[in-house]
Amino acid sequence: IVNGSDCQKDAQPWQGALLLGPNKLYCGAVLISPQWLLTAAHCRKPVFRIRLGHHSMSPVYESGQQMFQGIKSIPHPGYSHPGHSNDLMLIKMNRKIRDSHSVKPVEIACDCATEGTRCMVSGWGTTSSSHNNFPKVLQCLNITVLSEERCKNSYPGQIDKTMFCAGDEEGRDSCQGDSGGPVVCNGKLQGLVSWGDFPCAQRNRPGVYTNLCEFVKWIKDTMNSN
């Protein structure tokens, strides 16, 4: 997150981190039920660990943290690397969470976000596009949902109904490492961090997010059948 601020501890209890090896964060994730996460389909890896209930970027133990393995990764069938359409994936964890103030699921919005809606995006991704600067703790940023027209003008030929754009003034944006993390609007999960321009946080190049209202049925059906 570029030019966000430290999230309040436990304010984003649905926020997850996908880790390679012992502690290499490569993507965010969102807890949507006691045993299921959502993340971006482009975050799919054969082996990874899941960390919930953690505030710090560092591997230091926190009392609220819970660690999991993914036992099933189910990318949306319409996703095709390296494209950006249908960029979501369900992850079933090896066990259910212990519900606590640090770890709680978030409800998915059934209605699509409208222009001007204020939302919160969060993550442990880079705080600049130099790729070296990571935050000490989870970062939060208020962003505004942009019109479809403005979104398409920013990225001609690249935007479809499975995406929406959101941003703020120049210099505030999600960035590398935030993929798969939550965009929460009015207390409900509206989107996932997906893509945007490089470097992050450029004028007229907003962040692009997976438009989850288009996938509510697929998410429910997939969870029920697995």
Partner: antibody, heavy 126, light 107 residues
Framework: EVQLVESGGGLVQPGGSLRLSCAAS????????MNWVRQAPGKGLEWVSY????????DYADSVKGRFTISRDNAKNSLYLQMNSLRAEDTAVYYC???????????????????WGQGTTVTVSS | DIQMTQSPSSVSASVGDRVTITCRAS??????LAWYQQKPGKAPKLLIY???SLQSGVPSRFSGSGSGTDFTLTISSLQPEDFATYYC?????????FGGGTKVEIK
């Protein structure tokens, strides 16, 4: 078959110009970032330039900055390198290479260059 | 810029030998290192990405390890087709930089 084919190399005098082309086939060219990498005779690999899939981000090695220009035409599945003010030290085989990393995607994961052309030779000599 | 230093610059080995090549970055690059193989007159070929992930179609005798600044490419049992030059490359930070190369020669 995924393929990259370079062309446009040749003999040029110091101070002259050349335009290299790289024709892509067998994959969705417009979805991938691309690079130019060169190799001087008997030497190692040197990265020259990078261009993102939508051309919104471009970078160059310091040794060619201000003299070389990378560009692409996604409709034509083509990558280009315009080389001006050429010097003897630019003599090399020039490769185009597909970058597996999408700098647009916001994961923190980096791959490398998975598809390379056969190279085209540029000789700068008087 | 990040400097990549490879060692040794050349190594003589026999078929069946275990060969280890090291690469050191001048600053930490996490796991974001790629290894390439190049044969004379040919284009480089991606062997390993993210320090230890084998590229599709690459034989399992090739393996990579390391994180931060120190990385290793290992060929567990050298085959005749493995005699080539090997390069490391750091990929997270522009400008991309390659190591100087390690030539694996027949003893």
């Amino acid at each position: 078959e995924v393929q990259l084919v370079e062309s446009g190399g040749g003999l040029v005098q110091p101070g002259g110009s050349l335009r290299l082309s790289c024709a892509a086939s067998g994959f969705t060219f417009g979805s991938y970032a691309m690079n130019w990498v060169r190799q001087a005779p008997g030497k190692g690999l040197e990265w020259v330039s990078y261009i993102s899939s939508s051309s919104s981000f471009i970078d160059y090695a310091d040794s060619v900055k201000g003299r070389f220009t990378i560009s692409r035409d996604n409709a034509k599945n083509s990558l280009y390198l315009q080389m001006n003010s050429l010097r003897a030290e630019d003599t090399a085989v020039y490769y185009c290479a597909r970058d597996l990393t999408s700098m647009q995607s916001r994961d923190y994961y980096y791959y490398g260059m998975d598809v390379w052309g056969q190279g085209t030779t540029v000789t700068v000599s008087s | 810029d990040i400097q990549m230093t490879q060692s040794p610059s050349s190594v003589s080995a026999s078929v069946g030998d275990r060969v280890t090549i090291t690469c050191r970055a001048s600053q930490g690059i996490s796991s974001w290192l790629a290894w390439y193989q190049q044969k004379p007159g040919k284009a480089p070929k991606l062997l390993i990405y993210a320090a230890s992930s084998l590229q599709s179609g690459v034989p399992s005798r090739f393996s990579g390890s390391g994180s931060g600044t120190d990385f290793t490419l290992t060929i567990s049992s050298l085959q005749p087709e493995d005699f080539a030059t090997y390069y490391c490359q750091q990929v997270p930070i522009f400008p991309y930089t390659f190591g100087g190369g390690t030539k694996v020669e027949i003893k």
